[in-house]
Structure formats: structure tokens, C-alpha cells
């Protein structure tokens, strides 16, 4: 483990500071981690990492003159599971062919860059659950149709918060199994079109906090378990509760919205088929009692994956077999915002 210009320890290579002006061609091909920090790289050239069969992580951080990532930079790397590209404000262009054939990819971070479009992930084809973390890219304005097709054969988490997203097209999430979608802090985002989740499974968790979104789509929220819409002042109405059959936790802006969930009873037709199996009924009742009260989403400031990155999903949620829905909702109605005012009497309604 030795290199003339990059620091290394145990096959981890750190190429650091202004003396690094290009990706060294003589980095050992058995490296397991490569980090390029505070360098003067202007271009990451085609095939820069080809042949790194053991490479697990790449970090490209605080490279203020980086402008271009060419084709085939992150391609055909069988063990690569983490890519971090951050704090590169002059990075304006990532070639659509930059990311290809990364069967073990689990985490892709692109933050604080100048890119104008979401990276093309169609050819990544990961066999793992993927967290795509694209934050603080203020020049990204649009999410096009089919933006995430081909990212993973498994489920995906999309953290698209704090960008400049203003428009999301119908079918944007087509072809994805969407565990979580975070669109928070896209301050100019006003609309989620009705067919935005067409062709997608999920989302299970949706965060639209601190956006200007005024309504949720009518379709595609059947699997939604957690909704977070803090400081989303334009969101004045929610879809009918029949569209939110799986909802368990809601963290909203107005206390009045929580009133809708009080004593809401799910229709038998909405229950999961497994609930009809009489053999399971007793076990289901026992399990739902044993699991007790859930913690409030309002207290859950960080997303479920940010603490660790254990991508395994939970077992079947037997709470779905309860006819009476216990939706944990905040902010709770109080003396100043009582449910009676809006829900209590027909004349007031």
C-alpha cells in the first residue's frame, strides 16, 4: 500500500489537496476505497476507474474546479456499493453514460453540485436496495418521466430534498419499488401530478415538508404508511381516506388535518387478504396488542435509513389487519384547534 502522490492505508487511497490535478493512472487496481478530496481535478476522464475489481467506495468531495464527469467513469465495478460526489459547485455535467452496470450499488450521493439534470441511472441495474441521495443541487429544476427506471431490481429510497425542483412529470417514478420519497425543502415545488406514481410501487414513506405542494395525487398512495408534510402551508386538503389505506403515521402542518383520522374505520374490503385467513386471526390480534403504541413521526426527525443503512425491510405489518385504524398524527388538535369545530356538527362543516 504505497503511492507517490496519494495517501493510503490498508488499500484505502486518499488523493488530497491541490497537487492532485488528475486521477493518477497508477493507482493499484486492488484498492477498496478511493477518495478525492480538495483536489484540483477539472475532469474525471472516461474509464478513470476501469479495472478496479475490488473497489467498494468512491468519494469525490470538495473539488471546487471539477466541471465534468465523463462517460464510463462509474462502470462495470462489481463490488462498488457507495459513491459520494459532493461539494463540487462547478460540476455542471455528468455524462448520461457515467453510471453503468453497478450490481452492488447501495448508496449514491450527489450533493452541492451545479448539475442541471438528475444523473442518468437507467443503466446502473443494481441487485441491491439503493438509497439515491441527491441534495442541495439548486440547479435541478425538473424530474422527468421514467427518471429512475433501471436504478435497481430491488426497492429504492429517493432523497431528493433541498434541490431546486419546481416540476415533477407524470410517471416520474415509473418502474420503481419506492420505499421512501423525500421531496422536502424544494421550496418552489407546487404540484405532484395525479399520475406521478403511475407504474411505481409505493411510496411507503413520503416527505413533502417545506414545499408549496397544494394537493396530493389521487392515485399511487395505496402503500403510504408515513406522510410528512411539515410547514407545507399550501396543502389545504388531503385525499379521501380510502386512498390512504395503509397510512399509520402523519406529521402535518395543520392540526385540523389530524381530525380526519379520529375514529376512522377501515372498510373490510380494504384489509389485506392475509387478514381473512381465520387461522391467523388470533395471532394477528395478539401481535397487534403486543406491539403497543407507535412512536410519533413528529419525533422521528431523521429518516429510517439515515441512522444505519440496514436496508432490510420489516415483516408483514399485522396492524393492517386492524379494522380500527390507529393513525399517529401530529400536530394534535388542542383547545385552540378542536376537532369539534370542523368535524363535530353538520352545520359547522
Amino acid at each position: 500500500c504505497h503511492h507517490r502522490i496519494c495517501h493510503c492505508s490498508n488499500r484505502v487511497f486518499l488523493c488530497q489537496e491541490s497537487k492532485v490535478t488528475e486521477i493518477p493512472s497508477d493507482l493499484p487496481r486492488n484498492a477498496i476505497e478511493l477518495r478525492f478530496v480538495l483536489t484540483k481535478l477539472r475532469v474525471i476522464q472516461k474509464g478513470a476507474f476501469s479495472g478496479f475489481g475490488d473497489l467498494e467506495k468512491i468519494e469525490i468531495s470538495q473539488n471546487d474546479v471539477l466541471e465534468v464527469i465523463e462517460a464510463d467513469v462509474f462502470s462495470n465495478l462489481p463490488k462498488l456499493h457507495e459513491i459520494r460526489i459532493e461539494k463540487a459547485n462547478n460540476l455542471l455535467y455528468i455524462n448520461p453514460e457515467a453510471f453503468q452496470n453497478l450490481p452492488n450499488l447501495q448508496y449514491l450521493l450527489i450533493s452541492n453540485t451545479g448539475i442541471k439534470h438528475l444523473p442518468d441511472v437507467h443503466k446502473i441495474h443494481s441487485l441491491q436496495k439503493v438509497l439515491l441521495d441527491i441534495q442541495d443541487n439548486i440547479n435541478i429544476h425538473t424530474i422527468e418521466r421514467n427518471s429512475f427506471v433501471g436504478l435497481s431490481f430491488e426497492s429504492v429510497i429517493l432523497w431528493l430534498n433541498k434541490n431546486g425542483i419546481q416540476e415533477i412529470h407524470n410517471c416520474a417514478f415509473n418502474g420503481t419499488q419506492l420505499d421512501e420519497l423525500n421531496l422536502s425543502d424544494n421550496n418552489n415545488l407546487e404540484e405532484l401530478p395525479n399520475d406521478v406514481f403511475h407504474g411505481a410501487s409505493g411510496p411507503v414513506i413520503l416527505d413533502i415538508s417545506r414545499t408549496r405542494i397544494h394537493s396530493l395525487p389521487s392515485y399511487g398512495l395505496e402503500n403510504l404508511k408515513k406522510l410528512r408534510a411539515r410547514s407545507t402551508y399550501n396543502l389545504k386538503k388531503l385525499p379521501t381516506l380510502e386512498k390512504l389505506v395503509a397510512l399509520m403515521e402523519a406529521s402535518l402542518t395543520y392540526p385540523s388535518h389530524c381530525c380526519a383520522f379520529a375514529n376512522w374505520r377501515r372498510q373490510i374490503s380494504e384489509l389485506h387478504p392475509i387478514c381473512n385467513k381465520s387461522i391467523l386471526r388470533q395471532e394477528v390480534d395478539y401481535m397487534t396488542q403486543a406491539r403497543g403504541q407507535r412512536s410519533s413521526l413528529a419525533e422521528d426527525n431523521e429518516s429510517s435509513y439515515s441512522r444505519g443503512f440496514d436496508m432490510t425491510y420489516t415483516e408483514f405489518d399485522y396492524d393492517l389487519c386492524n379494522e380500527v385504524v390507529d393513525v399517529t398524527c401530529s400536530p394534535k388538535p388542542d383547545a385552540f384547534n378542536p376537532c369539534e369545530d370542523i368535524m363535530g356538527y353538520n352545520i359547522l362543516r
Epitope: 507517490r4 502522490i5 496519494c6 495517501h7 486518499l14 497537487k19
Partner: antibody, heavy 120, light 111 residues
Framework: EVQLVESGGGLVQPGGSLRLSCSFS??????????VGWIRQAPGKGLEWVAH???????RYNPALKSRFTLSVDRSKNTLYLQMNSLRAEDTATYYC????????????WGHGTLVTVSS | DIQMTQSPSSLSASVGDRVTISCRAS??????????LNWFQQKPGKAPKLLIY???NQRSGVPSRFSGSGSGTDFTLTISSLQPEDFATYFC?????????FGQGTKVEIK
């Protein structure tokens, strides 16, 4: 084979000046990643980094010594110099010339050293 | 400046003994997952020789009985089975930031 040979040491009075030379071979200071510098060791004491220069002429000094010590290099002769001014008794030490690799900032090869004695 | 403190200052040991020398930095010498900590051996009247770099990486040609470990502020040099030629003074050194600094040294003597 890398070799570093120091010269120019000797006895000098307090306030005086001295110029040390290090003739190196087996590597080129024009090669990316190469550096050469000085480390000193007072008699019976520990080691102290003095200064070094990288292949791109980037010079780094120990802040405690920078005002009095100056590095220069003659690439055609593969020779590093350390000009020492306003010498003090506490500058008495063996001065080692070292080859430094930018990767891990490794002191890969050392000369045998030259003794500088500052005394009246 | 980052201060480097070694312990013990000296120790007596016999051939075949396992010897450990500690080095503590006044602040972390890690940067982006790499520890900028080196170990040197110096024999009387000779220049120091690099043994270990980046805390745990053995320089080529150094006997395998020498190993390094640690991260952050606490580091250890271990000689698994002391040999007669290992009686010397050992120094740790940080190169995370200028000025690069050395420990005061640990002298390993024959018991």
C-alpha cells in the same frame, strides 16, 4: 539506490550564518510526488522537522524557524540547500537530509547527518 | 501544534519478549479515514529508519515482528518477539498537519 549526503556543518558563533548542502541521487525532484527536506536532532534529544520542498517548488517551513531558515534547490545539481541565519545555541543539532514521499508524507530515506554546533 | 507523547520513556526487556510502545496525540491525526502516524527506529549514531506508516502499514523490508495499530489519538507499536538488533530508540511522528511533530522517543534497553 537512493542516497543523500549532507555537508556544510561545523562550528559557528551565535548570530552567525551557515549554509548546509544535501546532494541526493537515485531520484529526481522533478518527479511528481517527490520531496526533500531537513530534520534535526539536538544531542541526546528528540527529532524536529525543519523544512521541506516538493517537486512543484512548494516549500514548507516549521513556523518556529521560518524567519531565520531558507530552503533552495539546484535541480541541475540535485542539491538542496538550507541557509541558516541568526544562529542560536539551541540550533546546535545533527541536521539530516530526508527524501519525502508525498503519499503519506513518508520520510523514506535519510542521510547520515551533519553536525552544526553554535557556540562562542 | 499537535503534541506527541510517548510512553514509557524507556523500558527494559529480554530477547523474545513482546514489547508495546504507546503514542498519544494531543488531537486526532486522522484525515478521511487515514491515520497520519509513522514510527521510526533509531540506533545510536545512526539516522532514523521508517518502520510503520499510516499507523499500521509496514514498510517493505521491515521484519514482520513490527506492527502498528490505533487511530485518532492513540497508537501502539508492537514488537512481537524482541530480537538483539531491536534494542534502539523508537519515535512516533504525525504528518497530519504542519509542523510535523515527533514524540520524545522510547528507549528499549536490554534487561
Amino acid at each position: 539506490e537512493v542516497q543523500l549526503v549532507e555537508s556544510g556543518g561545523g562550528l559557528v558563533q551565535p548570530g552567525g550564518s551557515l549554509r548546509l548542502s544535501c546532494s541526493f541521487s537515485g531520484f529526481s525532484l522533478s518527479t511528481s510526488g517527490m520531496g526533500v527536506g531537513w530534520i534535526r536532532q539536538a544531542p541526546g534529544k528528540g527529532l524536529e522537522w525543519v523544512a521541506h520542498i516538493w517537486w512543484d517548488d512548494d516549500k514548507r517551513y516549521n513556523p518556529a524557524l521560518k524567519s531565520r531558515f531558507t530552503l533552495s534547490v539546484d535541480r541541475s545539481k540535485n542539491t538542496l540547500y538550507l541557509q541558516m541565519n541568526s544562529l542560536r545555541a539551541e540550533d546546535t543539532a545533527t541536521y539530516y537530509c530526508v527524501q519525502i514521499n508525498y503519499g503519506n508524507y513518508r520520510f523514506d530515506n535519510w542521510g547520515h547527518g551533519t553536525l552544526v554546533t553554535v557556540s562562542s | 501544534d499537535i503534541q506527541m507523547t510517548q510512553s514509557p520513556s524507556s523500558l527494559s526487556a529480554s530477547v523474545g519478549d513482546r514489547v508495546t510502545i504507546s503514542c498519544r496525540a494531543s488531537e486526532s491525526v486522522d484525515n478521511y479515514g487515514i491515520s497520519f502516524l509513522n514510527w521510526f527506529q533509531q540506533k545510536p549514531g545512526k539516522a532514523p529508519k521508517l518502520l510503520i506508516y499510516a499507523a499500521s502499514n509496514q514498510r517493505s523490508g521491515v521484519p514482520s515482528r513490527f506492527s502498528g495499530s490505533g487511530s485518532g489519538t492513540d497508537f501502539t507499536l508492537t514488537i512481537s518477539s524482541l530480537q538483539p538488533e531491536d534494542f534502539a530508540t523508537y519515535f512516533c511522528q504525525q504528518s497530519k498537519e504542519v509542523p510535523w511533530t515527533f514524540g520524545q522517543g522510547t528507549k528499549v534497553e536490554i534487561k
